[in-house]
């Protein structure tokens, strides 16, 4: 069954029907429909079956509509039912105001029912002409917008429709006036100078697009010097002026072809700038020194002129950098008078000429620089110069292979002599000296001199190694030393240390009586004034005793037997054998043999006797330990 | 016990001469090396002159040369210093000083004054 | 001056100090300390290697290395405020040479 058709209006464009029916029971509604009048063709739609509900849009606003809708089961059309409702009347746009009005925009606010447009058209029209409208749309969503680009002081209509697919609303309008152009603020000169100056001015930010800029030379007809600058600027500098001028200035922003009402100034540029207070003064006996004023950053550059009073043909130029104010002029003749002028240059344009006479001074004598008193860290200079004349002595010491800082020494200009010290020994230095006073430098006049050695004591040598001793010799400075102490220490501290003192003359010392075999350490000082050198030391070893070893017996006779034994080859001079019978019943016997000997046969001794046989080694008058055997003679 | 006792100081005027004298007792002294050491007023300590036992050899600082000259008389156990051509700077306190051989000065006096001023 | 030191030094009382001393004649020849206290004559403390005359306390000891000596006082007393003075030969011409001092401070 299908029934309850209701129809209620959906804005001012659309209807909405809902029904009831058994569920699961309809294929498909068709819905139909039609203006009450029947001027238009009915619209069908089909819809399925489970729908209960349907909106119809796009119809025309208040406006009667019959509504029908029957139901399809199976191929068969249930009744039809029907409805009858109208379409709402269309929406209107509600106020439009100007919220805010400028001198060149405006912003428009206006109302209108939400969602019900798809845009707004905008008309822009100036009042009393018949230029064409500026028109723009802006979405529906929106509820104001800024028009931009308007002119200042103009009467605008401005108008707004809202629009949808098929319709327009009617037009609201506002009438507004824009504001005018917004002045310049001050304008004023900060700086003045006799050939430019700096203009600044005030204005609100971001208005203008450019300012133009006019200087013109007042009670002139000449052509005015034009100058546009941006519109971000609010300074500006005015080169290329005339000095001592009267120059009118005048300025006025720019707008979109809109001109402010111009600012004026006067201003009168400074008078050119001139050189000042020249003075000459005497820089030693060769140069000249000047000094003069002029206004900063104003010259390009100086020419100076330079001559003998009494010399009008020599003239010497410079050019100097404008930035400078005073300048050395050397070279010059000693006790001269000169002529010194000066003039600017300022684009080309030169100042009048300052002129000064100034003399140099008479040339002071320094010379005859002389070194003596020569010791290893010291010496003495003297030399003569112009009395009266100098403040100070100026010595520079160099060594010549420039491997120390250079010393420097300011003296009073009385002196005649220096002593310098401290320096470092067997050293060439070369001595400048130059005199000082006011003003005045002397040529440098030099010396050389060379420090004398530190006193040497070096290259301990032992020789003459033996048993018994040894020689120490050493070198040393001639004269340097008062004495000289011989330290002699046996390596292991054993013995007490044995000490030779000997005269400074002196350069070696044989030792003798030591112990053989055993190691030595001796050292060598010197000693000046008491002050004792750090020694040189050497370490040796005695040579060992000689040895006599291995005395053996054989070959026994009735009167006698043969003896044989070993000893170090080269050392002996001689050897000794003392022979005596055990129970000294006769003279012992003493026989010296020559070095090479290792062997002996002794006779004419008693048969059947015990001997005690005695050998020892000589070398260098020195004798060797003893050995020792026992023999008996073979039976008659 | 070894005393040196100075004397012969004083005020003397620039380019004057002063003699000092130093008595030694209480050790040998012709056995040791003397000499002069001086401190000007708030300096340090400048080596002046030195002699040998016998007097033969004399040493001098660069400052003194030919100005000064020491001397010894061991018979009568004194060291001398004579000072000619006196400078401002040779203002000092004058000490005596024994050294033996093998040894820097071991021995002072308690120094003698020389002021030079005009 | 030939033999160069440190004008002034200070020390802890009962720590330890090293008083230097510079010179090319260290190179060759011991430096000698001298400690003076104001008024007094200069007293000899240290000479040669490292050696002390009688009465000087063993506290005082000295080294050398090079052209620099060194006099080092291991436990400082009160006693030891003064001026030190090293001193050696710079050879025959010069045959003396004093340093400038250097003023010990015991805090």
């Known amino acids: 069954e299908l029934e309850n058709l209701t129809v209620t209006e959906v804005g001012w464009d659309g209807l909405r029907l809902n029904w009831t029916a058994a569920d699961q029971a309809y294929e498909h509604f068709i819905i139909q429909v039609q203006e009450a009048n029947k001027v238009e063709a009915a619209r069908n739609l089909t819809v399925p079956g489970s729908l209960r509900a349907v909106d119809i849009p796009g119809l025309k606003a208040a406006t009667p509509y019959t509504v029908s809708i029957y139901g399809v089961i199976q191929g068969y059309r249930t009744p039809v039912l029907s409805a009858e409702a109208s379409t709402g009347e269309t929406p209107n746009l509600g106020e439009v105001v100007v919220a805010e009005v400028g001198w060149d925009a405006l912003k428009l606010n206006w109302t209108a029912p939400e969602g019900a447009y798809e845009y707004f058209f905008i008309q822009v029209q100036e009042a009393d002409t018949v230029e064409a409208a500026q028109n723009l749309t802006v979405p529906g969503g929106l509820r104001s917008t800024d028009l931009p680009g308007l002119k200042a002081a103009t009467h605008y209509t401005i108008t707004i429709r809202g629009v949808t697919q098929d319709f327009s609303t009617t037009p609201l309008s506002v009438e507004v006036l824009t504001e005018e152009v917004p002045d310049m603020g001050n304008l004023t000169v900060t700086e003045v100078s006799w050939d430019a100056l700096r203009l600044n001015w005030t204005t609100p930010d971001g208005t203008y697009d450019q300012f133009t800029i006019q200087v013109q030379e007042a009670d002139q007809v000449e052509e005015a010097h034009n100058l546009t600058v941006p519109g971000s600027l609010r300074s500006m500098e005015i080169p290329g002026l005339r000095a001592g001028t009267p120059y009118t200035v005048t300025l006025h922003g720019e707008v979109r072809g809109h001109s402010t009402r111009p600012l004026a100034v006067e201003v009168v540029t400074e008078d050119l700038p001139q050189l000042g207070d020249l003075a000459v003064s005497e820089v030693g006996w060769d140069g000249l020194r000047l000094n003069w004023t002029a206004a900063d950053n104003a010259y390009e550059h100086f020419v100076i002129q330079v001559q003998e009073v009494n010399k009008v043909e020599a003239a010497q130029n410079l050019t100097l950098p404008g930035s400078l104010r005073a300048v050395d002029i050397p070279g010059l003749e000693a006790a001269t008078p000169y002529r010194v002028s000066i003039y600017g240059v300022i684009r080309g344009y030169r100042t009048p000429v300052l002129s000064a006479e100034a003399s140099t001074a008479k040339e002071p004598e320094i010379g005859n620089l002389n070194v003596s008193d020569i010791t290893p860290e010291s010496f003495n200079l003297s030399w003569m110069a112009t009395d009266g004349i100098f403040e100070t002595f100026t010595i520079e010491i160099i060594d010549s292979n420039r491997l120390l800082e250079t010393v420097e020494y300011n003296i009073s200009g009385a002196e005649r002599t220096a002593h310098i010290s401290g320096l470092p020994p067997s050293t060439d230095f070369i001595v400048y000296l130059s005199g000082l006073a006011p003003s005045i430098r002397t040529k440098t006049i030099s010396a050389t001199a060379t420090t004398e050695a530190l006193p040497l004591l070096e290259n301990l040598t032992i020789s003459d190694i033996n048993p018994y001793g040894f020689t120490v010799s050493w070198m040393a400075s001639e004269n340097a030393f008062d004495s000289f102490l011989v330290t002699v220490v046996d390596s292991g501290k054993l013995l007490d240390p044995q000490e030779f003192t000997l005269s400074g003359t002196q350069r070696k010392l044989e030792l003798r009586g030591l112990i053989t075999g055993i190691g030595y350490e001796v050292m060598v000082s010197g000693f000046t004034q008491g002050h004792q050198t750090k020694p040189l030391r050497a370490e040796i070893v005695t040579e060992a005793e000689p040895e006599v070893d291995n005395l053996l017996v054989s070959d026994a006779t009735p009167d006698g037997f043969r003896l044989s034994w070993t000893a170090d080859e080269g050392v002996f001079d001689n050897f000794v054998l003392k022979i005596r019978d055990t129970k000294k019943q006769s003279e012992p016997l003493e026989i010296t043999l020559l070095a090479p000997e290792r062997t002996r046969d002794i006779t004419g001794l008693r048969e059947a006797t015990e001997y005690e046989i005695e050998l020892y080694g000589i070398s260098k008058g020195r004798r060797s330990q003893t050995v020792s055997a026992i023999a008996t003679t073979a039976m008659g | 016990e070894v005393q040196l006792l100075e004397s012969g100081g004083g005020l003397v005027q620039p380019g004057g001469s002063l003699r000092l004298s130093c008595a030694a007792s209480g050790f040998t002294f012709s056995g040791s090396r003397m000499g002069w050491v001086r401190q000007a007023p708030g300096k340090g300590l400048e080596w002046v002159s030195a002699?040998?036992?016998?007097?033969?050899?004399?040493y001098y600082a660069d400052s003194v040369k030919g100005r000064f000259t020491i001397s010894r008389d061991n018979s009568k156990n004194t060291l001398y210093l004579q000072m000619n051509s006196l400078r401002a700077e040779d203002t000092a306190v004058y000490y005596c000083?024994?050294?033996?051989?093998?040894?820097?000065?071991?021995?002072w006096g308690q120094g003698t004054l020389v002021t030079v001023s005009s | 001056s030939e033999l160069t030191q440190d004008p002034a030094v200070s020390v802890a009382l009962g720590q330890t100090v090293r008083i230097t001393c510079q010179g090319d004649?260290?190179?060759?020849?011991?430096a000698s300390w001298y400690q003076q206290k104001p008024g007094q004559a200069p007293v000899l403390v240290i000479y040669?290697?490292?050696n002390r005359p009688s009465g000087i306390p063993d506290r005082f000891s000295g080294s050398s290395s090079g052209n620099t000596a060194s006099l080092t006082i291991t436990g400082a007393q009160a006693e030891d405020e003064a001026d030190y003075y090293c001193n050696s030969s710079h050879g025959p011409r010069r045959p003396v040479v004093f340093g400038g001092g250097t003023k010990l401070t015991v805090l």
């Open positions: 040669g290697k490292n």
């Open positions: 002699i040998n036992e016998e007097g033969g050899q004399t």
């Open positions: 000083a024994k050294h033996p051989p093998h040894r820097p000065f071991d021995y």
């Open positions: 004649s260290l190179r060759l020849y011991y």
